[in-house]
């Protein structure tokens, strides 16, 4: 007998053939001999059963000798087998229809749980293979779980169903609700103005929810909120911010702060929080601020930097044009007596530069004698 | 809600060969056949063929000679290319969904045939 | 082939006027035929299926009737919406074929 695997929803073709290609009587019965629909003539007649009204046929292959039929928005109760009769002989065809769904919505925050549900006929023993949009493969049987959802998790995951050597194909489409970066660092020299973004990783219709930029200032014992938003169908509206910082917030999507000028007190690690509505839990993305300073005082330049740096940054002092170098993987160089000219401070990571900032030097004069 | 979408050449030059794509979107591709039909400026409406998931094709005979209709499963999609075109195959060609009626219908490409 | 014949080619009707459109095949097709309505710019819109079954969404004024080779769609009471052409397909065999149609117009 032949098997064919459908999908809850979907409409299915039951193929049955006659071996003259002219139309002849046929009928199409279920496993308890209750009739689905066959032909009178010329016309298609239904019978009593329940998918009667799901069921077709395409009159225009039946002088081929072709006599399927049709199911239209199979349910998992339609899981049987069907009786074609024809020429006096008999075809069976096994319908298993399969279902597959997730558990909760589709629309999930990063690091919560997918669970996907199989629904199948009784007696079956189906396994089912998913693939996520990253290559991920996950098995199981009546459940599939994935514990920890991550961004590349996002978009259509591929779940086979295989029953009986025939397989049949589930195309999940799964929206990680998450930041399009987990951390990010912002460089900058003194006094410039700084931007943040905080773009995300997925677009929904209707985006609501509020939000909260925490700080931690290098210098600082504590760390404080700088500004509180809200956020109602993509538009931005700020609830609340700092007198020190002034922050700017864009009034669209995505999320953007502009910090003035950047100062050493403000260098350090904040924090940004998005927690959107109908959902439990929230986005997160960390982003921190590195300023640097260079300064000439009496017979001393100094370069420093304050924020968040990795020990194998390398901070140096160049004088442009002259070998002159001081190097040190430190969060502060100085050359005592400096040579006339302009002066590079840079911070950089395995030879790229990740700031500079230049200062110039100019030549001091001996202070004449008073007579 | 099923939609179908179709795209392709508008214009084209005597002996070329036209093409034109249908995605389907939001409901079943297995199970039903899958058609084009066109309509040439002023005139009926003309059958062309038809493909179903497993690639069995049924054709109009006027032009079974220059049609091949194919399908990508994979992306929910059937072509239709009609070589060696000439003036003649100048229409607006729709795809559509069919089990025994046209139902429902692409948006409709009008294809020009003009050197 | 099997030839599907319209008529009238084009009807001129007020609104709330009651119109019929017949089409005729060229041998038995039994109950496989379906009505269509085309307006311009757009695809054309199922009305009727198997002969008389009205498809779901489409107005109750649109009926259809007729086996074998002689059919007809009835619009009960026209309104401005129903000016268009109309078409009639069998489903009976390959290659399917329409009617040459039917256009409607406000007289």
């Known amino acids: 007998k032949k098997v064919v695997l459908g999908k809850k929803g979907d409409t299915v073709e039951l193929t049955c053939n006659a071996s003259q290609k002219k139309n002849t009587q046929f009928h199409w019965k279920n496993s308890n001999q209750i009739k689905i629909l066959g032909i009178q003539g010329l016309f298609l007649t239904k019978g009593p059963s329940k998918l009667s009204d799901r069921a077709d046929s395409r009159k225009s292959l039946w002088d081929q000798g072709c006599f399927s039929m049709i199911i239209k928005n199979l349910k998992i109760e339609d899981s049987d087998t069907y009786i074609c009769e024809v020429e006096n002989k008999k075809e069976e065809v096994e319908l298993l229809v399969f279902g597959l769904t997730a558990n909760s919505d589709t629309h999930l925050l990063e690091g919560q749980s997918l669970t996907l549900t199989l629904e199948s006929p009784p007696g079956s023993s189906p396994s089912v293979k998913c693939r996520s949009p990253g290559g991920k493969n996950i098995q199981g049987g009546r459940t599939i779980s994935v514990p920890q959802l991550e961004r590349q998790d996002s978009g259509t995951w591929t779940c086979t169903v295989s029953q009986d050597q025939k397989t049949v194909e589930f195309k999940i489409d799964i929206v990680v609700l998450a930041f399009q970066k987990a951390s990010s660092t912002v460089y900058k020299k003194e006094g410039e103005q700084v931007e943040f973004s905080f773009p995300l990783a997925f677009t929904l219709e209707k985006l609501t929810g509020s939000g909260e930029l925490w700080w931690q200032a290098e210098r600082a014992s504590s760390s404080k909120s700088w500004i509180t938003f809200d956020l109602k169908n993509k538009e931005v509206s700020v609830k609340r911010v700092t007198q020190d910082p002034k922050l700017q917030m864009g009034k669209k999507l995505p999320l953007h702060l502009t910090l003035p000028q950047a100062l050493p007190q403000y260098a350090g690690s904040g924090n940004l929080t998005l927690a959107l509505e109908a959902k439990t839990g929230k986005l997160h993305q960390e982003v921190n601020l590195v300023v640097m300073r260079a300064t000439q005082f009496q017979e001393n330049l100094t370069c420093e930097v304050w924020g968040p740096t990795s020990p194998k940054l390398t901070l140096s002092l160049k004088l442009e044009n002259k070998g002159a170098t001081v190097s040190k993987q430190a969060k502060a160089v100085w050359v005592l007596n400096p040579e006339a000219g302009m002066w590079q401070c840079l911070l950089s990571d395995s030879g790229q530069v990740l700031l500079e900032s230049n200062i110039k030097v100019v030549p001091t004069w001996p202070t004449p004698v008073q007579p | 809600q099923v939609q179908l979408q179709q795209w392709g050449a508008g214009l084209l030059k005597p002996s070329e060969t036209l093409s034109l794509t249908c995605a389907v979107y939001g409901g079943s591709f297995s199970g039903y056949y899958w058609s084009w039909i066109r309509q040439p400026p002023g005139k009926g409406l003309e059958w062309i063929g038809e493909i179903n998931h497993s690639g069995s094709t049924n054709y109009n005979p006027s032009l079974k000679s220059r049609v091949t209709i194919s399908v990508d499963t994979s992306k929910n999609q059937f072509s239709l290319k009609l070589s060696s075109v000439t003036a003649a195959d100048t229409a607006v060609y729709y795809c559509a969904r069919v089990i025994n009626w046209f139902d429902p219908w692409g948006q409709g490409t009008l294809v020009t045939v003009s050197s | 082939d099997i030839q599907m014949t319209q008529s009238p080619s084009s009807v001129s009707a007020s609104v709330g006027d009651r119109v019929t459109i017949t089409c005729r095949a060229s041998q038995d097709i039994s109950s496989w035929l379906a009505w269509y309505q085309h307006k311009p710019g757009k695809a054309p819109k199922l009305l009727i299926y198997?002969?008389?079954s009205l498809q779901s969404g489409v107005p109750s004024r649109f009926s259809g009737s007729g086996s074998g080779t002689d059919f007809t769609l009835t619009i009960s009471s026209l309104q401005p919406e129903d000016f268009a052409t109309y078409y009639c397909q069998q489903a009976n065999s390959f290659p399917y074929t329409f009617g040459q149609g039917t256009k409607l117009e406000i007289k």
């Open positions: 198997a002969a008389s």
